[in-house]
Amino acid sequence: TMCSAQDRTDLLNVCMDAKHHKTKPGPEDKLHDQCSPWKKNACCTASTSQELHKDTSRLYNFNWDHCGKMEPACKRHFIQDTCLYECSPNLGPWIQQVNQSWRKERFLDVPLCKEDCQRWWEDCHTSHTCKSNWHRGWDWTSGVNKCPAGALCRTFESYFPTPAALCEGLWSHSYKVSNYSRGSGRCIQMWFDSAQGNPNEEVARFYAAAMHVN
């Protein structure tokens, strides 16, 4: 069920217990570029938002360009994904406890709006990678992720033949692709215009209520 392994009682307006997150969400006027939609209420700091826009940022030493230069149209989705991960205070219903050296909690099965996943896949399927799960299996001996020996660089489409394969497989099911569309109030938007407020607040409220009913 949705609430299996759910230890938290506070599901709304919360920050995850992870590497760079604030312990409490709040305004951050100077959030950088693609993270700016969260400036009214964020779990990330301005410096985190700045750092995550860099190639091989110090946050995780993760190199998007592990198979040659990632297309800018593709990279922007990974930056947005990282903004959502670091900054969103509206993912409480999907927080799970984990036993990892670098974080105590993670997101699991966040219902990502189907168009956000589709567009991510469309913009990335001709960029190159060497792995279908980016959480594990890298060669970290240099301090930066490199393709493990024998893992061939191929198009994203080779490793992620469908949008769901990308969005769900990439980060070990942090996301699941929702059947709902953007603006429905039933799925999390990676992209939104903050002038209209943060649509993910309503989504979190809906799923938090559903969890309390179960």
């Epitope: 198979c67 040659g68 399927h125 001709t126 190159h128 060497c130 393709c147 020996a149 024998g150 893992a151 061939l152 660089c153 191929r154 198009t155 489409e157 080779s158």
Partner: antibody, heavy 118, light 106 residues
């Protein structure tokens, strides 16, 4: 800029062997598979086999199994294709090609003409 | 084995479709190459209708069942060439090429 530069033309006698080289530059050599494809005069392209440049694993076409050997030297970013027991019908242009998606070859060498004649 | 029509012609500016048939295409995408005399092949379409950079958008690919198609919309004189399809053969990760189609632009 990705480039694949092949060795020069060869003339061989029937029964001999030939070894064609393909030097890669402009990308991480060990991250991609390299395939070999040949084309006899006026004929179709014919796939011969491939090598995983990272770990050296190879796959060969049934037609060439036992006669072809594909190797690589990672320090020189170079792939090699050796064909033995040559016969006149092996006269062809031999190409190396980088694989980006199970048979999608985005960069090709300029080709090496191998002529087998007594 | 992949089967192609040996020759196809098209009037300048018109649309032409080149087909490729074979069992491997039921479970694998076709890739398409353009080859001009004395030159190495050039990848024009791969995977699910992807064009490498530098390939004009008049080239497109599609597939249905065991048949893949390359469509050139508004053929130009520069498109006159041989066109080859290829496909992965899932068993053994082998690759097979079609026999090629000679395109003439009239």
């Amino acid at each position: 800029e990705v480039q694949l530069v092949q060795s020069g033309a060869e003339v061989k006698k029937p029964g001999a062997s030939v070894k064609v080289s393909c030097k890669a530059s402009g990308y991480t050599f060990t991250s991609y598979a390299m395939h070999w494809v040949r084309q006899a005069p006026g004929q179709r392209l014919e796939w011969m086999g491939w090598i995983n440049a990272g770990n050296g694993n190879t796959k060969y076409s049934q037609k060439f199994q036992g006669r072809v050997t594909i190797t690589r030297d990672t320090s020189a970013s170079t792939a090699y294709m050796e064909l033995s027991s040559l016969r006149s019908e092996d006269t062809a242009v031999y190409y190396c090609a980088r694989d980006i998606s199970y048979g999608s070859f985005d960069y090709w060498g300029q080709g090496t003409l191998v002529t087998v004649s007594s | 084995e992949l089967t192609q029509d040996p020759a196809v012609s098209v009037a300048l500016g018109q649309t032409v479709r080149i087909t490729c048939q074979g069992d491997s295409l039921r479970s694998n995408y076709a890739n398409w190459y353009q080859q001009k005399p004395g030159q190495a092949p050039v990848l024009v379409i791969y995977g699910q209708n992807n064009r490498p950079s530098g390939i004009p958008d008049r080239f497109s690919g599609s597939s249905s069942g065991n048949t893949a198609s390359l469509t050139i919309t508004g053929a130009q004189a520069a498109d006159e060439a041989d066109y080859y399809c290829d496909s992965r053969v899932s068993t053994g990760n082998h690759v097979v090429f079609g026999g090629g189609t000679k395109l003439t632009v009239l």
